[in-house]
């Protein structure tokens, strides 16, 4: 079957796989006149890899809490047994009622865009529900994900999130919208309002049009022992143990303390949804306790003291002292001052010596004072804040915060590439390619100090020499290396990087990028001498910029062959001279040749070679450049992209036969010598014809 080039270009030629995994087809190329020999197009078929999703794809979350995704929720696998690290989820549509984030990253950062199955297995992918202002009983969120692992086809997945007060939540013991307890002065009365006790989330399970005729019935199952509950000034008792959410909302529920001490009080209750006029409805219910704290009327509330942030390295443990948490309270013992964790950061947890390994959520000032309370930095090295509430058991809780700054255990200065200085400029800005500090995350606040300066230049900020600079200045392109001495093609300097109390040193290498145009073209014929001219090496731009004649010094190479100066005319004595130095002018005059040698000790065939040159010009630093080229056995039928000054001996003999023709002109830089241009006049006339005509 015949296929045209335009069909190929148009993507109309398809390969359909059938049979074995390895195979292909033979083809010939033809332009209508000439036909190439046969070619073989190899095709390797891959077994189709299929991705599959297991797991419930549903996540139940307690209101206002953080829940990790687990393998029970989301478990991807592939028919090829792909490493979980390579099973990538992309978040196509993020959650609406909360956010998705990575446990090891700053939880205040942007929303997660992608994550791997391995991270799910590690419990590092977290869903955090954000409490809305309006009460609800059950809310539903969805995450749209795309699972991919090339070469398999992507798979779309939807993760359903159910946020429900029905769930048993260790971090939220109440099933009600609010059950915060009450503070009442000794012997006095206090109103229990919806700020303290609110079951309107039970009502939220009823569609809003019918909600006004529904209510929540509270039945007191254990009455306060040191006071009395009143509804609209009517006492509640065993014979009348009920009150309604609507009465709570109207401010009709009151607790009256009977006096005689400041012991704790409270009541137990059952709450359930009721329909219009108390009819039965299949709504939620809960049994809970409401705490009432009686405080001494004369008591002075505790005064929190200023807190110093706790600083410790990642992976370590540090005691919390009075510098971090302390209060002034003349009428409370340290053991009576209680702290409760309201919200913990994700960079570690608090633990009590002798209190087990797990995190603690309650502790006293006595625990702090005795050094029993410690922070364990098991998360990433980010700053975090504990939101605490502190109370002496007699005053309303006061909010407090404890800042924890996790320092990296070590930092690394990443040097991705040496600093390249353009030759004609002699200066260049440093970037993140040269200097970037990472710990377990990037350290954008890093600072650098020069501990060993460069030999041939200066570091500048704002045009002035400096020995200290910041990552921010690097990122803004403000830190510049400038050569001050034009005698070396490279330099280096050593810096000490400091990030969050940890340091590391690194050496930055500086190289000069030659302002040189190098073009080797296709392969060059072995055994031939070719002309080195501005089509191959050109420092003309450097000459213009420096108003000088650039000089080249051969540092190395070629391995097989040599650079030679060719005689100007046949009257010039001697053959070609070996060259170690030359100028741009020599290149422009066509005075240079490259004798391309054959690799010894092996069968003839393609090879690679190179020249390493140092390029000098007035007023700029030198630069090292290389000319890499491929070589092959001479092929008389092949058009070469450089001017040939001579061809191999064998080819010349062939060319001397009667049927060979004499060239009439010089091959241009891109012209070729299909037949060796060595005719009756011998080698010198070949040179004359090619170089000086």
């Amino acid at each position: 079957r015949t296929r045209s080039g335009s069909q190929l270009d148009g993507g109309l030629v398809l390969f359909s796989h059938r049979g074995t995994l390895d195979g292909g087809f033979r083809f010939r190329l033809s332009d209508g006149e000439h036909t190439s020999p046969g070619h073989f197009f190899r095709v390797t078929a891959q077994k189709q890899v299929l991705l599959s999703l297991k797991g419930s794809q549903t996540l139940t979350v307690c209101p206002g809490s953080v829940q990790p995704l687990s393998s029970q929720t989301l478990r991807a696998s592939s028919s090829a047994g792909t490493d979980p690290q390579l099973l990538l989820y992309r978040v196509v549509r993020g959650p609406q009622l909360g956010r998705l984030f990575h446990a090891q990253q700053d939880s205040t950062g942007e929303a997660l865009v992608n994550f791997t199955q391995a991270e799910v297995y590690a419990g590092n992918i977290l869903y955090e529900h954000e409490m809305p202002p309006e009460p609800f009983w059950e809310a539903h969120d969805t995450l749209e994900l795309q699972l991919s692992s090339p070469p398999a086809r992507d798979v779309a997945a939807t993760l359903a999130v159910a946020v429900s007060f029905e769930a048993a939540c260790p971090q939220r013991p109440s099933h009600l919208w609010k059950n915060k307890g009450l503070w009442v002065p000794e012997g006095q009365r206090a109103r229990i309002t919806v700020a303290a006790l609110d079951a309107s989330n039970l009502l939220a399970s009823v569609p809003s049009p019918q909600r006004s005729e529904h209510d929540v019935l509270f039945q007191v199952t254990q009455f306060p022992s040191r006071g009395q509950l009143l509804v609209s000034e009517e006492p509640l008792h065993a014979g009348q143990p009920h009150f309604l959410q609507s009465q709570l909302a109207a401010g009709q529920l009151v607790y009256a303390h009977g006096g005689g001490g400041t012991q704790q009080d409270g009541f137990h209750f059952r709450a359930h949804l009721q329909g219009p006029a108390g009819a039965s409805v299949a709504g939620p219910q809960t049994s809970e306790a409401f705490a009432i704290t009686v405080r001494d009327v004369n008591e002075r509330p505790p005064q929190p003291q200023a807190s110093v942030p706790l600083r410790l390295t990642r992976g370590s443990r540090a005691p919390i002292s009075r510098a971090q948490l302390s209060v002034v309270d003349p009428d409370s013992a340290p053991g009576e001052i209680e702290y409760e964790v309201q919200r913990a950061p994700h960079n570690g947890f608090l633990s009590l010596v002798g209190g087990g390994l797990g995190p603690v959520t309650r502790f006293t000032q006595a625990d702090v004072d005795s050094g029993r309370l410690a922070f364990v930095a098991n998360g990433s090295s980010v700053a975090g804040i504990f939101q605490l509430s502190m109370s002496d058991g007699a005053s309303p809780p006061l909010p407090m915060s404890l800042a924890v700054d996790i320092l990296p255990s070590a930092i690394e200065v990443q040097l991705r590439a040496p600093l390249e200085v353009p030759q004609a400029l002699g200066r260049s800005s440093l970037s993140q390619q040269q200097l970037r500090v990472v710990s377990d995350r990037e350290e954008p606040e890093a600072a650098y100090r020069l501990i060993q300066g460069p030999q041939y230049g200066h570091l500048l900020v704002g045009g002035r020499p400096t020995s200290a600079f910041s990552q921010f200045q690097i990122d803004q392109g403000e830190v510049v290396f400038a050569f001050t001495n034009s005698s070396s093609s490279h330099d280096h300097f050593r810096v000490l990087a400091l990030a969050r109390g940890v340091n590391a040193s690194a050496v930055v290498n500086v190289t000069v990028r030659a302002l040189l145009h190098v073009w080797a073209g296709g392969p060059w014929p072995q055994g031939a001498t070719l002309r080195l001219d501005p089509t191959v090496l050109d420092a003309g731009e450097l000459a213009n910029r420096t108003d000088s004649v650039p000089r080249f010094r051969l540092l190395e190479g070629p391995r097989h062959g040599r650079v030679v100066r060719v005689p100007r005319a046949r009257t010039e004595p001697g053959g070609s001279q070996l060259v170690e130095q030359f100028t741009q002018q020599d290149l422009e005059d066509g005075r240079l040749g490259l004798e391309v040698g054959r690799p010894e000790g092996r069968a003839p065939g393609p090879a690679g070679d190179s020249l390493t040159l140092e390029l000098w010009a007035q007023g700029v630093p030198p630069a090292v450049a290389s000319l890499d080229f491929a070589t092959e056995p001479y092929n008389a039928a092949r058009p070469y992209s450089v001017a040939l000054l001579s061809v191999p001996e064998a080819a010349r003999t062939e060319a001397g036969k009667p049927e060979s023709s004499t060239p009439t002109g010089e091959p241009g830089p891109m012209a070729s010598s299909p037949e060796p241009a060595v005719a009756k006049g011998g080698f010198l006339s070949f040179l004359e014809a090619n170089m000086f005509s």
Partner: antibody
Framework: QVQLVQSGAEVKRPGASMKVSCKAS????????IHWVRQAPGQGLEWMGW????????NYAQKFQGRVTMTRDTSTSTVYMELSSLRSEDTAVYYC??????????WGQGTLVTVSS | DIVMTQSPDSLAVSLGERATINCKSS????????????LAWYQQKPGQPPKLLIY???TRESGVPDRFSGSGSGTDFTLTISGLQAEDVAVYYC?????????FGPGTKVDIK
């Protein structure tokens, strides 16, 4: 203490309307539903409907739908029950009852309405 | 509508003896969510309005003597007067307060033998 005081007995002609009142005292009027229950002579109890004094919302038994209207006056803590198109079988003692949940904890003394030509 | 039936229609019991009244609903009045039976018992003496004795099938109203007790679940309920007194002579009604229309049983008349 909680009291529900109803209006006095009435005699009505068939086809006429009647309006019985129920005045509440001793508690927060708007906190509790008022139901109306009737009892024909020598018969059992029959629930007619309820009114929420707070919102004015009502719910009537299907049997009385279209004939009964329950209203309230929060300024006097009084609930009214009007029954139209009276027939002889509407002769009964009409009770108002206070409820919080759906049981009736307090009752009025009852109003006898006699429908007779 | 939920239909309530009572048995017996009437009973005569000696003073100090136990009186048992049964009540049956045509459908369950148990709310499985809060595990409550929405059933109440009332006592009515001649010329008086009814008086609440029991609600939620077994919870005695304040001030009601403890000789009155309620039991049962779902559709079958019982009111027991453990030691009948002279003042207990009355008609006893059960009522479902599960859903509207709230309905009463036809009543059971209790007399002294």
């Amino acid at each position: 203490q909680v009291q529900l005081v109803q209006s006095g007995a009435e005699v009505k002609r068939p086809g006429a309307s009647m309006k019985v009142s129920c005045k509440a005292s001793g508690y927060t009027f708007t906190n509790y539903y008022i139901h109306w229950v009737r009892q024909a002579p020598g018969q059992g109890l029959e629930w007619m409907g309820w009114i929420n004094p707070n919102s004015g919302a009502t719910n009537y038994a299907q049997k009385f739908q279209g004939r009964v209207t329950m209203t309230r006056d929060t300024s006097t803590s009084t609930v009214y029950m009007e029954l139209s198109s009276l027939r002889s079988e509407d002769t009964a003692v009409y009770y108002c009852a206070k409820s919080w949940v759906s049981w009736f904890a307090s009752w009025g003394q009852g109003t006898l309405v006699t429908v007779s030509s | 509508d939920i239909v309530m039936t009572q048995s017996p229609d009437s009973l005569a019991v000696s003073l100090g003896e136990r009186a048992t009244i049964n009540c049956k609903s045509s459908q369950s009045v148990l709310n499985s969510k809060n595990n409550r039976n929405y059933l109440a018992w009332y006592q009515q003496k001649p010329g008086q309005p009814p008086k609440l004795l029991i609600y939620w099938a077994s919870t005695r109203e304040s001030g009601v003597p403890d000789r009155f007790s309620g039991s049962g679940s779902g559709t079958d309920f019982t009111l027991t007067i453990s030691g009948l007194q002279a003042e207990d002579v009355a008609v006893y009604y059960c009522q479902q307060h599960y859903s509207t229309p709230f309905t009463f049983g036809p009543g059971t008349k209790v007399d002294i033998k």
